[in-house]
C-alpha cells in the first residue's frame, strides 16, 4: 500500500501518477524544466529520494489550457496500460485515507 | 561505439576495499540513470546499486546498505561502485548497466558492460 | 519484495524446436515484466520489455506475453545461437528482482 513519503519506482509510480492526476494526465517533469530531452524530474525526486501527495499532484497536467505547455502535451499511456492501480502493493483505502490525512 | 566498460576488479581479503570504475562512450552518459548488477559464479543476476542521472539520488540492495557507496561523474563519463568492509558473499562478476529512457514510461537495462571479477578470500 | 520465479530452471531442446520459458511473479507487476538472455561468460542482453515489446535488433522467434503474475518467453523456432540461460525481471517496483534463470540446452 501507498504511504506517505515512501519512494516509488518504476510502474508503481507510474500507476500511482495515473491514480492522483485521473483524467488530467501527468508529466514526468514539471512544466519549468522540460529542456531535457530526457525528462525524469519525478524519478529522481520520487524513486531516488521520497515523495508525498502533494508532489506527485505537481506532475498532473493542468487542466487550464492557458496554464499548459502545449508543444510536450501530458503523458497518454497505451490502451494496455491499467487505468489505476493494479499492483498489489497498491490499496485503494489505504491511498484514499493517506490523500484525506494529508489534505487536512 | 556505444559502450560500458568496467575496471577494477581483482582479488580482495575479507574486510578489504575496492573501486571499480565503468567508462561510457558513444552516448550522453549525463542524461541515465545507471546500474551496479552483480553475479556470483554460477549463480543468477542481482542488482546491488542505482544512481540517478543528475548523481542526486542513490538507491542500495539490503545486502550491500552502508559498505557500498554508488557515485558518477558525469564530467569524465564514468560510473563508479566503492566497496568496503568485503565479504566472500560479495565474490562475483559486476556489470555496470544503463537505464532505460523512459520515453516509453518502462525501465529495463538496455546496455551492459562486460563486466569485471571481484573476488573475496583470504 | 517482489519474488520472481522461473521455470523450468533447465531446458534441452533441438534446433527447429519451438520452446517456452514461464516467469511468475509474487505479485502483481502488470506488465512491467523484462526478458534477457546470457551467453557463458558473456553480459546479459535485452531481448523483450513490457512483458511482450521486442528491443530493438532481437530476431522476431523471439515473443513474450503475460500480465499481471504470469508471463512467458516463447522461441519460435530454436536456433544454435539459442542456446543460453534466459532470465526474467520485474520493474515494478525497487528492488528490481530477477528470476533465476532458465539454462536451455541443446539436446
Known amino acids: 500500500a501507498y504511504r506517505p513519503s515512501e519512494t516509488l519506482c518504476g510502474g508503481e509510480l507510474v500507476d500511482t501518477l495515473q491514480f492522483v492526476c485521473g483524467d488530467r494526465g501527468f508529466y514526468f517533469s514539471r512544466p519549468a524544466s522540460r529542456v531535457s530531452r530526457r525528462s525524469r524530474g519525478i524519478v529522481e525526486e520520487c524513486c531516488f529520494r521520497s515523495c508525498d501527495l502533494a508532489l506527485l499532484e505537481t506532475y498532473c497536467a493542468t487542466p487550464a489550457k492557458s496554464e499548459r505547455d502545449v508543444s510536450t502535451p501530458p503523458t497518454v499511456l497505451p490502451d494496455n496500460f491499467p487505468r489505476y492501480p493494479v499492483g498489489k502493493f497498491f490499496q485503494y483505502d489505504t491511498w484514499k485515507q493517506s490523500t484525506q490525512r494529508l489534505r487536512r | 561505439e556505444v559502450q560500458l566498460l568496467e575496471s577494477g576488479g581483482g582479488l580482495v581479503q575479507p574486510g578489504g576495499s575496492l573501486r571499480l570504475s565503468c567508462a561510457a562512450s558513444?552516448?550522453?552518459?549525463?542524461?541515465?540513470?545507471m546500474n551496479w548488477v552483480r553475479q556470483a559464479p554460477g549463480k543468477g543476476l542481482e542488482w546491488v546499486s542505482s544512481?540517478?542521472?543528475?548523481?542526486?539520488?542513490?538507491l542500495y540492495a539490503d545486502s550491500v546498505k552502508g559498505r557500498f557507496t554508488i557515485s558518477r561523474d558525469n564530467s569524465k563519463n564514468t560510473l563508479y561502485l566503492q566497496m568496503n568492509s568485503l565479504r566472500a558473499e560479495d565474490t562475483a562478476v559486476y556489470y555496470c548497466?544503463?537505464?532505460?529512457?523512459?520515453?516509453?514510461?518502462?525501465?529495463?537495462?538496455?546496455?551492459w558492460g562486460r563486466g569485471t571479477l571481484v573476488t573475496v578470500s583470504s | 519484495d517482489i519474488q520472481m520465479t522461473q521455470s523450468p530452471s533447465s531446458l534441452s531442446a533441438s534446433v527447429g524446436d519451438r520452446v517456452t520459458i514461464t516467469c511468475q511473479a509474487s505479485?502483481?507487476?502488470?506488465?512491467?515484466l523484462n526478458w534477457y538472455q546470457q551467453k557463458p561468460g558473456k553480459a546479459p542482453k535485452l531481448l523483450i520489455y513490457?512483458?511482450?515489446r521486442l528491443q530493438s535488433g532481437v530476431p522476431s522467434r523471439f515473443s513474450g506475453g503475460g500480465s499481471g503474475t504470469d508471463f512467458s518467453l516463447t522461441i519460435s523456432s530454436l536456433q544454435a545461437e539459442d542456446f543460453a540461460t534466459y532470465y526474467c525481471?520485474?520493474?515494478?517496483?525497487?528492488?528490481?528482482?530477477f528470476g533465476q534463470g532458465t539454462n536451455l540446452e541443446i539436446k
Open positions: 558513444g552516448f550522453t552518459f549525463s542524461v541515465y540513470d
Open positions: 544512481i540517478s542521472s543528475s548523481g542526486g539520488g542513490t
Open positions: 513490457a512483458a511482450s
Open positions: 548497466a544503463r537505464d532505460s529512457d523512459t520515453s516509453s514510461y518502462y525501465w529495463y537495462y538496455d546496455l
Open positions: 525481471q520485474q520493474s515494478y517496483s525497487f528492488p528490481r528482482t
Open positions: 505479485h502483481d507487476i502488470s506488465n512491467y
